[in-house]
């Protein structure tokens, strides 16, 4: 891997609660919103469109499609001004595991 | 002031109307005479957190953009032969 593109070891510059968590298992992708505020109501957007019925910290897609579901995700709370953005592109497969 | 993600051929590029500020993660290469950051090949799963560069007065209008690629280059299919 090209030295210039290495992932930095310094992952302490932004607090963990400000990061999205992405969990992938088989074809299911679960995105967890950063802790925008501890007990506020959450809204999700995908490519700038409101995701209807999504009001939890987790946004789950059971049959994730790389083509249809990759893109910009944002979550925010009613009383939080700054949206958190994620650009996600994921390739999934039903019966596989990722090895290092 | 929002980072945009573009893919050209097999590479991932981040761009802003200013320049891209890396907060953490994949370092990438700043393209010369450009407001674009080259994060490298997408099959290498670039990941990180970025913001558009902004003046102190405008910094509140530059949200964080987390980039997460998972192209499954190291995925192994589990079938009866694999499990045997």
């Amino acid at each position: 891997q090209d030295e210039d593109f290495k992932a930095s070891d310094d992952l302490t510059s932004i607090s963990p609660e400000k990061r999205f968590k992405v969990s992938i298992s088989g074809t299911e992708v679960v995105v967890t919103c950063p802790d925008v505020f501890g007990y506020d109501n959450i809204k999700w957007e995908k490519n700038d469109n409101l995701v209807e019925g999504a009001s939890n910290r987790e946004l789950s897609q059971k049959e994730f499609s790389e083509v249809d579901d990759s893109g910009y995700y944002a979550c925010y709370a009613d009383s939080i001004k700054e949206k958190s953005y994620l650009y996600l592109r994921a390739r999934v497969c039903a019966n596989c595991i990722e090895v290092n | 002031f929002k980072v945009s993600v573009e893919e050209l051929e097999d590479r991932v590029f981040l761009s802003c109307n200013t320049s891209v500020l890396r907060i953490e993660g994949t370092m990438g290469i700043q393209l010369p005479h450009s407001r674009t950051l080259d994060l490298g090949k997408r099959i290498l799963d670039p990941r990180g957190i970025y913001r558009c560069n902004a003046t102190e007065e405008q910094s509140d209008k530059a949200p964080y953009m987390q980039v997460y690629y998972r192209m499954c280059q190291n995925c192994v299919e589990l079938n009866s032969a694999t499990l045997a």
């Epitope: 607090s15 007990y39 709370a77 009383s79 | -």
Partner: antibody, heavy 116, light 107 residues
Framework: EVQLVESGGDLVKPAGSLRLSCVAS????????MSWVRQGPEKGLQLVAG????????YYTDAVRGRFTISRDNAKNTMYLQMNSLRDEDTAIYYC?????????WGQGTLVTVSS | SYELTQPPSVNVTLRETAHITCGGD??????VQWIQQIPGQAPVVIIY???NRPTGIPERFSGANSGNTATLTISGALAEDEADYYC?????????FGEGTQLTVLR
Amino acid sequence: EVQLVESGGDLVKPAGSLRLSCVASGFTFSDYSMSWVRQGPEKGLQLVAGMNSDGSTTYYTDAVRGRFTISRDNAKNTMYLQMNSLRDEDTAIYYCAKGAAAPDYWGQGTLVTVSS
Amino acid sequence: SYELTQPPSVNVTLRETAHITCGGDRIGSKYVQWIQQIPGQAPVVIIYKDNNRPTGIPERFSGANSGNTATLTISGALAEDEADYYCQVGDNYTWVFGEGTQLTVLR
């Protein structure tokens, strides 16, 4: 007009219990997160507890976690704060507030005094 | 943890304009509330989400927020505006308050 009316404050001995209520009107209660905040004798304001609109997510400040329980009854437009194992330092005026991070209305408060 | 900085006191002549500031790192990326507390009375939100007034709050109160500073402006201060003013933001899991600014209206 938004109204938040707290009740249940009293003089109580250390280790005692109290239950505060906050009755809301003038807005759709079930759409909003709600909060309890207190102001002690030293004038400082402190968020005590909060709960999202459907009651599925709660927050407690470290000083009260494990002793206080926030709850709500959306059918009755009412929020509660059950306070157990009360301590001297819990003495304060307790206010309920509409909203989570950016509250726009507070009630008039109810006084809780913990003293032997 | 996040900190908000307010001047301890501000003086304004009756019917003149008062500005109370609230400083915080990238505060413009957060919603700011301004809370008025007249001595012996309950706190009242006079501005929420930077520049919105709850019902019943006079138009002379306005708010602005960008960069590292939020400002409460009282245009044509009246004697009844003499009070403590707190700025507040929601940060991570809790509320953060400024130390408060005592506004004195000089007659």
